[in-house]
Amino acid sequence: IWSAVFLNSLFNQEVQIPLTESYCGPCPKNWICYKNNCYQFFDESKNWYESQASCMSQNASLLKVYSKEDQDLLKLVKSYHWMGLVHIPTNGSWQWEDGSILSPNLLTIIEMQKGDCALYASSFKGYIENCSTPNTYICMQRTV
Amino acid sequence: IWSAVFLNSLFNQEVQIPLTESYCGPCPKNWICYKNNCYQFFDESKNWYESQASCMSQNASLLKVYSKEDQDLLKLVKSYHWMGLVHIPTNGSWQWEDGSILSPNLLTIIEMQKGDCALYASSFKGYIENCSTPNTYICMQRTV
């Protein structure tokens, strides 16, 4: 989080920012920034693999849910969107694109349909779906 | 929008940021920043007047919808939340807290209940509601 004095090199002037306020990012242009993570919701429907490729082309990954507190904006997301969670048939676990295992109690996984990919739904639910099904998707970029 | 070079005065070092990336804000701590506007969704239910007072106490106002393009993150908001739109009985118009009139085609106004205040719902819908009814609310702060 950036401190209260910034150099605006565009105008070469110092700007005072109240200490209760802060800048968020950096993020790709026109992405949502929240608690120093960057998010973008994509309207076009793609299958999971195409969605993953779209995020990667923007130096991002599909949504990773790692904290209900830090990501509480996800509570209010309407509809269903691909996230970066996939089923590993060999050991039956669910893991994120980066290889980490889904932490217990983060998502309620609803595994009623056949599939190896997961859609994020509001209130931290994950619906298992066929990876080839077109859906909208959420990309995420974690800032350092 | 801040240019690609920032002074991190906390560590007194320059940080290179790709030109395609930018910082957003400044915003109150832990608010959502999008296209240089700040948003916060409040879980507690308050009537319209209490919601307005809560936003004002944080140097913000209730949500103002002024652009579908600049505020397209609002498309995907789940549930219904007070925004800063009120009915002026004298001339029958809908206006924002700042006195500006609701632009045509920005919101689909749905008069489900008798009332003079409006709830924001996903996909740019406004539901008319009695101002005394408790609801969650969205505060917004526009950055300069």
Epitope: K78, T108, Q113, K114, L119, Y127, E129 | -
Partner: antibody
Framework: QVQLVESGGGVVQPGRSLRLSCAAS????????MHWVRQAPGKGLEWVAV????????YYADSVKGRFTISRDNSKNTLYLQMNSLRAEDTAVYYC???????????WGQGTLVTVSS | QSVLTQPPSVSEAPRQRVTISCSGS????????VNWYQQLPGKAPKLLIY???LLPSGVSDRFSGSKSGTSASLAISGLQSEDEADYYC???????????FGGGTKLTVL
């Protein structure tokens, strides 16, 4: 096109058993959760049970728990409802349905009438 | 007694607008998508609204859905005689781990 055809309904005495079947065609049956929903004469819809795509997860309405069993045979594209210890209040048209978990696709059969009467 | 509460009947004149309410709890409507079904006499139900307010393809835009908190509503504008039917709300219930339906509302077009 998608078809769901229920069979096995009829008149049965209280305390007896009945098995309903639902033959599915026109979609990949083995990929989808399937439901039974019933409607008593002149009354509203009541959800009865759901089974996951592979039969590993089954959930029931409280009113039928312990008496009804939902099952499926994916090799035959068929859904079943085994109804034991039938009561007069189980009298209804029973619909087999694919309800939407995600999205807007739902399919219903035409229903089969079960009458429990002595 | 249905888990979701609907008025048993509503009536309105042709070309008018009518609203049907559906009240539930945080474990169903409050936390999950609401679907609305239309059932014509002697027919199976037909999906009218999904995910609170979305229209399946082929459904007239005279139908609209909304949701606030633990209540949902179905509105029908420009009423026509062919809209006479029973209407049901439905949602998944996290506590019961099952679908729950409203008791149904009979719409009469006067």
């Amino acid at each position: 096109q998608v078809q769901l055809v229920e069979s096995g309904g009829g008149v049965v005495q209280p305390g007896r058993s009945l098995r309903l079947s639902c033959a599915a065609s026109g979609f990949t049956f083995s990929s989808y959760a399937m439901h039974w929903v019933r409607q008593a004469p002149g009354k509203g819809l009541e959800w009865v049970a759901v089974i996951s795509y592979d039969g590993s997860n089954k959930y029931y309405a409280d009113s039928v728990k312990g008496r009804f069993t939902i099952s499926r045979d994916n090799s035959k594209n068929t859904l079943y409802l085994q109804m034991n210890s039938l009561r007069a209040e189980d009298t209804a048209v029973y619909y087999c349905a694919r309800l939407p978990w995600v999205g807007s696709v739902d399919y219903w059969g035409q229903g089969t009438l079960v009458t429990v009467s002595s | 007694q249905s888990v979701l509460t609907q008025p048993p009947s509503v009536s309105e004149a042709p070309r008018q607008r009518v609203t049907i309410s559906c009240s539930g709890s945080s474990s169903n409507i409050g936390n999950n998508a609401v679907n609305w079904y239309q059932q014509l006499p002697g027919k199976a139900p037909k999906l009218l609204i999904y995910y609170d307010d979305l229209l399946p393809s082929g459904v007239s835009d005279r139908f609209s859905g909304s949701k606030s908190g633990t209540s949902a509503s179905l509105a029908i504008s420009g009423l026509q005689s062919e809209d006479e039917a029973d209407y049901y709300c439905a949602a998944w219930d996290d506590s019961l781990f099952g679908w729950v339906f409203g008791g149904g509302t009979k719409l009469t077009v006067l």
